[in-house]
């Protein structure tokens, strides 16, 4: 059986400022289980955007649903975007693990810009 | 408003244990990596340790084995523990709320950690 | 570990002139330097990041440059709160993240 893939199809998306934006991700397996996070940055500083399993993301929506059997696509979407959104977006999978989930396979990364607000 | 404030400074003898606490507050501090960086009297910044948003822990090489860096989301509170404290630990302990560009965007005021006989 | 050298030590400028010191890394960090101001009695702040972009409100008169090993922080023209100590940092994706020894920029 082929491992896990974590594939981000878009390596750069451009959004203009005040929109939605659309990050995509899907996995090539259900195997292994465990949670998907979304991050900013792939440093030890990385900041958290959207966590399956827990947390408080206002912004953040899913673009399908993920507790749906068999459901491959982890894509997200962030409300009202601004520059300081800028950067760039990681989709990473966790191994469920004990007592802590560990680390898998993370997506490639896609870079968001923000364009100036049309007058 | 972004907010750090650090507790549990002190004067101790060397060998002995401290913790300090760091409480967070004005953003949502799961989210975030955050650190400890410390300056000994009239010198530099050192960074001594942190902690990642999923727990994964960082050390200096000048505290490792002898400093722990932990956090508990549910109070918002960054954590070090130190022991077998030594007199060169002596200075000004600050946390500070991490970018994901990884530098160090708010500081607390600090706590001075005394090492001496 | 990536050793960040900083110089002068001291500098003295006359409030309204202008400021260059410098930061030279060990090896090479790219772009991932950032510069950090520090008062007497005072928490470090954060001036600028990935060597020339300025953190949120921070004047304009604070700019950086440089990349690879070499760096350089300018105050275009002083005032008086800009006495104070100026610190280099690597902020490559991992730790250790190393502070140069500081820059004290005082009153001529």
């Known amino acids: 059986e082929d491992e896990l893939q974590v594939i981000q199809p878009e390596k750069s998306v451009s959004v203009a400022a005040g929109e939605s934006a659309t990050l995509r991700c899907a996995m090539t397996s259900l195997i292994p289980v465990g949670p998907i996070m979304w991050f900013r940055g792939a440093g030890a500083g990385r900041e958290l955007i959207y966590n399956q399993k827990e947390g408080h993301f206002p912004r953040v929506t899913t673009v399908s649903e993920l507790t749906k059997r068999n459901n491959l696509d982890f894509s997200i979407s962030i409300s009202n975007i601004t520059p300081a959104d800028a950067g760039t977006y990681y989709c990473v999978k966790f191994r469920k693990g004990s007592p802590d989930d560990v680390e898998f396979k993370s997506g490639a990364g896609t870079e968001l810009s923000v364009r100036a607000k049309p007058s | 408003d972004v907010q750090l404030v650090e507790s549990g400074g002190g004067l101790v003898r060397p060998g002995e244990s401290l913790r300090l606490s760091c409480a967070a507050s004005?953003?949502?501090?799961?989210?975030?990596?955050v650190t400890w960086v410390r300056q000994a009297p009239g010198e530099g910044l050192e960074w001594v340790s942190l902690?990642?948003?999923?727990?994964?822990?960082y050390y200096a090489d000048s505290v490792k084995g002898r400093f722990t860096i932990s956090r508990d989301n549910s109070k918002s509170t960054l954590y070090l523990q130190m022991n077998s404290l030594r007199a060169e630990d002596t200075a000004v302990y600050y946390c500070?709320?991490?970018?994901?560009?990884?530098?160090?965007?708010?500081w607390g005021l600090g706590t001075l950690v005394t090492v001496s006989s | 570990e990536i050793v960040l050298t900083q110089s002068p030590g001291t500098l003295s400028v006359s409030p309204g002139e202008r400021a260059t010191f410098s930061c030279r890394a060990s090896?090479?960090?790219?772009?991932?330097l950032a510069w950090y101001q520090q008062k007497p009695g005072q928490a470090p702040r954060l001036l600028i990041y990935?060597?020339?972009t300025r953190a949120t409100g921070i004047p304009a008169r604070f700019s950086g440059s440089g990349s690879g090993t070499e760096f350089t922080l300018t105050i275009s023209s002083l005032q008086s709160e800009d006495f104070a100590v100026y610190y280099c940092?690597?902020?490559?994706?991992?730790?250790?993240?190393?502070f140069g020894g500081g820059t004290k920029v005082e009153i001529k």
């Open positions: 500070a709320k991490v970018t994901w560009k990884n530098v160090f965007d708010y």
């Open positions: 004005g953003f949502t501090f799961t989210n975030y990596a």
């Open positions: 902690i990642s948003v999923t727990g994964t822990t």
């Open positions: 090896q090479t960090v790219g772009s991932k």
């Open positions: 990935d060597a020339n």
């Open positions: 940092q690597q902020h490559t994706d991992w730790p250790p993240y190393t």
